[in-house]
Interface confidence: low
Amino acid sequence: FERTRSLQDPCSNCPAGTFCDNNRNQICSPCPPNSFSSAGGQRTCDICRQCKGVFRTRKECSSTSNAECDCTPGFHCLGAGCSMCEQDCKQGQELTKKGCKDCCFGTFNDQKRGICRPWTNCSLDGKSVLVNGTKERDVVCGPSPADLSPGASSVTPPAPAREPGHSPQ
């Protein structure tokens, strides 16, 4: 099949780093500066991604692979391939349209990114609050009085935090 395909489609012989130039009888031309092709048989080279502004270059563009960006200090990546940079906040804060805001009472954020999440409701599991929550930390649930029997575990770890999917508008 590959042999048949290459006979019918001269472009299939063009390796990565080149493009099949229809203007030149379908010869393989090197990708122009600032462009790349990551697979063979391509009829174009893609313009390299430019890591500018709040983005910084993690990997330079080559003729066969696109540049990869990450974010400058104080920002973190969001989206596939770091398509956005979002401002970091402090622990105990979340990013809103108006900037970093402290978590409301009853919520916490233990990371520099994402949203404030409600403290674990210990009573839902029949537990009591062993350590109070703060803006930066969830509550720690302890045993209810009925659980204080020999051999019972004294501390239940907080529920795992769900991954926030928040980005500013």
Epitope: P32, N34, T44, Q50, K52, G53
Partner: antibody, heavy 116, light 107 residues
Framework: QIQLVQSGPELKKPGETVKISCKAS????????MHWVKQAPGKGLKSMGW????????TYADDFKGRFAFSLESSASTAYLQINNLKNEDTATYFC?????????WGQGTSVTVSS | DIVMTQSHKFMSTSVGDRVSITCKAS??????VAWYQQKPGQFPKLLIY???IRHTGVPDRFTGSGAGTDYTLTISSVQAEDLALYYC?????????FGGGTKLEIK
């Protein structure tokens, strides 16, 4: 804000040379390639090619090889289009355009009139 | 070069109408299509890139769609200020090539 400001209109005779400037501001000049586009009177847009603002390497469309030259003055965040040996058919408005997956910001255009 | 054909040179519409401007590529261009608006005496402005992504600040009445060889720019509710020339452009191969333009006229 991002701006591309081009030099003023030019009236030239056939055989002369014209050099058009395109000064960029509001972003890091060397982060984006600069494209040049021709629009003849009453006609559509035609890509002339582009220049890599990091390396200064130009790429010309087939119809614009020979008499046309792209260049840079990176310290002044300025790109240039020079047309040598002007012909009547070079009468057009020439636009510079910053490129980031598309021509996202454009200069206001420079009108070049070639007439004897 | 890839030829981008905008079959309607002129389109007449009324304020508030929905209008679709079409563009056909001479070969599959894999959604590598942009749309530009050029008002009389002005430079072109980017509306849409990658076939459907709106550029910064473009009103949401402008939407792009399509795949393969056929692409459409739709204005959901035409405003008087939308009187302009609209160009499609491919960047699937170099050089990028533009369609011939569609002039939107307001009745």
């Amino acid at each position: 804000q991002i701006q591309l400001v081009q030099s003023g209109p030019e009236l030239k005779k056939p055989g002369e040379t014209v050099k058009i400037s395109c000064k960029a501001s509001g972003y890091t000049f060397t982060d984006y390639s600069m494209h040049w586009v021709k629009q003849a009177p009453g006609k559509g847009l035609k890509s002339m090619g582009w220049i890599n603002t990091e390396t200064g390497e130009p790429t010309y469309a087939d119809d614009f090889k020979g008499r046309f030259a792209f260049s840079l003055e990176s310290s002044a965040s300025t790109a240039y289009l020079q047309i040598n040996n002007l012909k009547n058919e070079d009468t057009a408005t020439y636009f510079c355009a910053r490129y980031d997956y598309a021509m996202d910001y454009w200069g206001q255009g420079t009108s070049v009139t070639v007439s004897s | 070069d890839i030829v981008m054909t905008q079959s309607h040179k002129f389109m007449s519409t009324s304020v508030g109408d929905r209008v679709s401007i079409t563009c056909k590529a001479s070969q599959d261009v894999s959604s590598a299509v942009a749309w530009y608006q050029q008002k009389p005496g002005q430079f072109p402005k980017l509306l849409i890139y990658w076939a459907s992504i709106r550029h910064t600040g473009v009103p949401d009445r402008f939407t792009g769609s399509g795949a393969g060889t056929d692409y459409t720019l739709t204005i959901s509710s035409v405003q008087a200020e939308d009187l302009a020339l609209y160009y499609c452009q491919q960047r699937y191969t170099t050089p990028p090539t533009f369609g011939g333009g569609t002039k939107l006229e307001i009745k």
